[in-house]
C-alpha cells in the first residue's frame, strides 16, 4: 500500500504569508511575487553573484513536529548558470546548503547559526542558461532530502546561500505514515513510518468483526517501512464458524447455508436430510429420524440406521446351518454397514427357548461381520433354531430400534459321523467314527452297515454304543462298503458317507494299521 504523506510545512501553498527570517536582515534572500497563469506565486530568491564571499541565510518559521520521527524535505528551485553573468563572476556559485535545527520552543527572531546542522549541499540537475532566462524558460529542479530521527517538539529549516543565483519556489516538509489497511481480514491502524531506514516497525493487526486467528495460526502482523509502505505480512485472520469472506469483511452464512469452522472456505449449502438453517449457522440440524455419528463431518448428509438385511435364508446341512443374507435396501445413506448374528434354540417337547451362543460354533465371530454369510455348526439334533441377523451402521447406536431379519430352521438329524479305517487284516476291518460332542448325549447307539462291493442283495448290520467296531469274518482281498449312522430316541440320524475299505490279500498278512 502506498505511503500517506502528512504535510508539516508548505511554502508554496501559504501564499507568501509565512514571513521567514532572513539573515543578515535586508540583504541576501528576498521574498518576491510573480504572476504565473494569472495566479500570484511567491518565491525566495537571492542573486548576489558579483559581490564576493556571501553567507546569506533564510530560516523557516518554527515547525511543530507532532508525531513525525523522520521528515522529508522537498525543494523546488531554479539556479542560474554562472556563465550567464558578465565575466563569469568568479565568486558565483551554483549550489546552496540545507540545514536544520531542533528545539522545544520557538526562538522567534533570535537566529543562531551554531544551532543548525547541515543536511546537505543542494545542487541543481539543470541550470538556467541565458537564452532560457531571456525566453522566460527557467529550468525547475526538484530535490528531496530526509532527516531523522527527530526528538524535540519542533524544528527549523535554513537555507544558506554562498553566492548563487537561486529562486526557491517550493519548500514542502512532510512525514510519512503507513495508511490504515485491511488485509487478510485484519485491520492495521494508520502507523507513523519509522525513522531508521533499515528497520521496519512491526504492527499488530486486529481481526475484523467475526474473524479469528485460526488455532495454531500466527497473529496478523505487518511491517511499516520508512517510506510509509506496508511490507511482509505475517499471519492472517479467518472468518469464524458461521461466517464467510465477502470482500474485506466476514458476512453471516445465508439461511440454508453453514460453515462449521474458521476457514477460508465459503459457507456450504446444508446437506441432504437436514433442516433449513438460520442465518449464521455453524451446522445444519438433522431432519427427524436422521442423525450424525460423532465422527461425521458437518458437510456430510445426515444419515439413519439401515433397514434390515433384505433377503435371509438358512440352509440346513446335518448339524450345520449356512446363513446367507443380502445387504439392506436402505443403507441409511452410509457405507459402514456391519452385521451381527444371534441364535436362539427351542426344545420342541417343552417349547422352552434360550440363547445358544455358548453351544454353537460360528465360522467367524458373529458380531461386526462385513460379509453376508456365516456357517453355524455344532447344532443339536431335534432342536428348533431361530437366527437373527441385524444390520447396523455408524448411527444405529443413536436409536433404540433395531433392524433385523430372522430365519428359523429345525435340526432333525445329527451330524453325519466322520468315519476312519483304523486297521485291517485279511479277514477284518477296524473302523472308528466321531460326531460333535454336543450331539453325543442324544445318541443311543451307532449302527454300522457293511456289504461287499458289487453285492446289492445282502448286507450286515452291527450296533454298538462305542465309537469303534471291528468287522470280522470278512473275505480276504475284498472291498467292503461301510456306512455308520447314529440312532437317537427320535429315530435315525444322518448317515455317514459310504466308505470303501479293502481287506488284505493272503500274501500281505499281518494286522496293518492304515
Amino acid at each position: 500500500a502506498q505511503g500517506k504523506e502528512v504535510v508539516l510545512l508548505d511554502f508554496a501553498a501559504a501564499g507568501g504569508e509565512l514571513g521567514w527570517l532572513t539573515h543578515p536582515y535586508g540583504k541576501g534572500w528576498d521574498l518576491m511575487q510573480n504572476i504565473m497563469n494569472d495566479m500570484p506565486i511567491y518565491m525566495y530568491s537571492v542573486c548576489n553573484v558579483m559581490s564576493g564571499d556571501q553567507d546569506n541565510w533564510l530560516r523557516t518559521n518554527w515547525v511543530y513536529r507532532g508525531e513525525a520521527e523522520r521528515i522529508f524535505i522537498e525543494l523546488k528551485f531554479t539556479v542560474r548558470d554562472c556563465n550567464s553573468f558578465p565575466g563569469g563572476a568568479s565568486s558565483c556559485k551554483e549550489t546552496f546548503n540545507l540545514y536544520y535545527a531542533e528545539s522545544d520552543l520557538d526562538y522567534g527572531t533570535n537566529f543562531q547559526k551554531r544551532l543548525f546542522t547541515k543536511i546537505d549541499t543542494i545542487a541543481p540537475d539543470e541550470i538556467t542558461v541565458s537564452s532560457d532566462f531571456e525566453a522566460r524558460h527557467v529550468k525547475l529542479n526538484v530535490e528531496e532530502r530526509s532527516v531523522g530521527p527527530l526528538t524535540r517538539k519542533g524544528f527549523y529549516l535554513a537555507f544558506q546561500d554562498i553566492g548563487a543565483c537561486v529562486a526557491l519556489l517550493s519548500v514542502r516538509v512532510y512525514y510519512k505514515k503507513c495508511p490504515e489497511l485491511l488485509q487478510g481480514l485484519a485491520h492495521f491502524p494508520e502507523t507513523i513510518a519509522g525513522s531508521d531506514a533499515p528497520s521496519l516497525a512491526t504492527v499488530a493487526g486486529t481481526c475484523v468483526d467475526h474473524a479469528v486467528v485460526p488455532p495454531g495460526g500466527e497473529e496478523p502482523r505487518m511491517h511499516c517501512a520508512v517510506d510509509g509502505e506496508w511490507l511482509v505480512p505475517i499471519g492472517q485472520c479467518l472468518c469464524q464458524a458461521g461466517y464467510e469472506k465477502v470482500e474485506d469483511a466476514c458476512q453471516a452464512c445465508s439461511p440454508g447455508f453453514f460453515k462449521f469452522e474458521a476457514s477460508e472456505s465459503p459457507c456450504l449449502e446444508c446437506p441432504e436430510h437436514t433442516l433449513p438453517s438460520p442465518e449464521g449457522a455453524t451446522s445444519c440440524e438433522c431432519e427427524e429420524g436422521f442423525f450424525r455419528a460423532p465422527q461425521d463431518p458437518a458437510s456430510m448428509p445426515c444419515t439413519r440406521p439401515p433397514s434390515a438385511p433384505h433377503y435371509l435364508t438358512a440352509v440346513g446341512m446335518g448339524a450345520k446351518v449356512e446363513l446367507r443374507w443380502t445387504p439392506p435396501q436402505d443403507s441409511g445413506g452410509r457405507e459402514d454397514i456391519v452385521y451381527s448374528v444371534t441364535c436362539e434354540q427351542c426344545w420342541p417337547e417343552s417349547g422352552e427357548c434360550g440363547p445358544c451362543e455358548a453351544s454353537v460354533r460360528y465360522s467367524e465371530p458373529p458380531h461386526g461381520l462385513t460379509r453376508t454369510s456365516v456357517t453355524v455348526s455344532d447344532l443339536e439334533p431335534h432342536m428348533n433354531y431361530t437366527f437373527t441377523v441385524e444390520a447396523r451402521n455408524g448411527v444405529s447406536g443413536l436409536v433404540t430400534s433395531r433392524s433385523f431379519r430372522t430365519a428359523s430352521v429345525s435340526i432333525n438329524q445329527t451330524e453325519p459321523p466322520k468315519v476312519r479305517l483304523e486297521g485291517r487284516s485279511t479277514t477284518s476291518l477296524s473302523v472308528s467314527w466321531s460326531i460333535p460332542p454336543p450331539q453325543q448325549s442324544r445318541v443311543w447307539k451307532y449302527e454300522v452297515t457293511y456289504r461287499k462291493k458289487g453285492d446289492s442283495n445282502s448286507y450286515n448290520v452291527r450296533r454298538t454304543e462305542g465309537f469303534s467296531v471291528t468287522l470280522d469274518d470278512l473275505a480276504p482281498d475284498t472291498t467292503y462298503l461301510v456306512q455308520v449312522q447314529a440312532l437317537t430316541q427320535e429315530g435315525q440320524g444322518a448317515g455317514s458317507k459310504v466308505h470303501e475299505f479293502q481287506t488284505l490279500s493272503p500274501e500281505g498278512s499281518g494286522n496293518l494299521a492304515v
Partner: antibody
Framework: EVQLVESGGGSVKPGGSLKLSCAAS????????MYWVRQTPEKRLEWVAT????????SYPDSVKGRFTISRDIAKNNLYLQMSSLKSEDTAMYYC???????????WGQGTLVTVSS | DIVLTQSHRSMSTSVGDRVNITCKAS??????VAWYQQKPGQSPKLLIF???TRHAGVPDRFTGSGSGTDFTLTISSVQAGDLALYYC?????????FGGGTKLEIK
Amino acid sequence: EVQLVESGGGSVKPGGSLKLSCAASGFTFTDHYMYWVRQTPEKRLEWVATISDGGSFTSYPDSVKGRFTISRDIAKNNLYLQMSSLKSEDTAMYYCTRDESDRPFPYWGQGTLVTVSS
Amino acid sequence: DIVLTQSHRSMSTSVGDRVNITCKASQDVTTAVAWYQQKPGQSPKLLIFWASTRHAGVPDRFTGSGSGTDFTLTISSVQAGDLALYYCQQHYSTPYTFGGGTKLEIK
C-alpha cells in the same frame, strides 16, 4: 392367495402424466416391500421403483428419478406409481411385484400397458 | 449397477434334451441370483432363488448352480411346456438388475 392387480395404463403423449394403481390382497400389505418392474417392447425387464414396508424408504433408478413417484395407501391396500414428464422410452408393460423375506419377486400382477407416443 | 449378461439371446433344443442357460454378473453377487420363466402372454414366474433353491411348485428338472459371478440354470429334460423366456436377476445389491433374457425354443 396373494393377488396383485394393476390398472391405469394407457396411451399418453410425450411430456404427459399417468398414475398406475396396484390392488393388493391375500397378505398383510404393511409387512412387505413393494416394487414396480417394467418390461420394454424388446422384452427387457427393468426395475422402476421400490417402497419399503413402512413407506419411509423409496428408491428409483436414475432413468426415472424425479419423474416417477411410488406411494402406498395402507387403508386401501393399494400401491401407486405416479409418472410425469413421460418419454417414448417409458413405453412398457408395468408390473407390480412383491417379495418375501428370503426371496425376490415370487408374486407378480398381470401387468398394465403404458404407451408413450406422439 | 451390477450388470447381468445372458450370452445367448435364444437357444434351440429338443424335448428330452438337457439345456444350460448361463448368466454372468459384472461383480460378485455371492449366491444371490434368481431365475424367472416367462411364457408367452404371461407375467414372469420365479423358478430359483439364492442360485440353487427351487421356489415352491417348481419341477425338479429345473436346477440352479453357481456363485460369485457365474450362474447356470439347467433344465435336465426339456418339456414342450418349457418354451419361454428365462431371465436371471441378482438380488444381492440394489438396484436389483435383470439379465437380458434367453429365449428357449423347441425344435
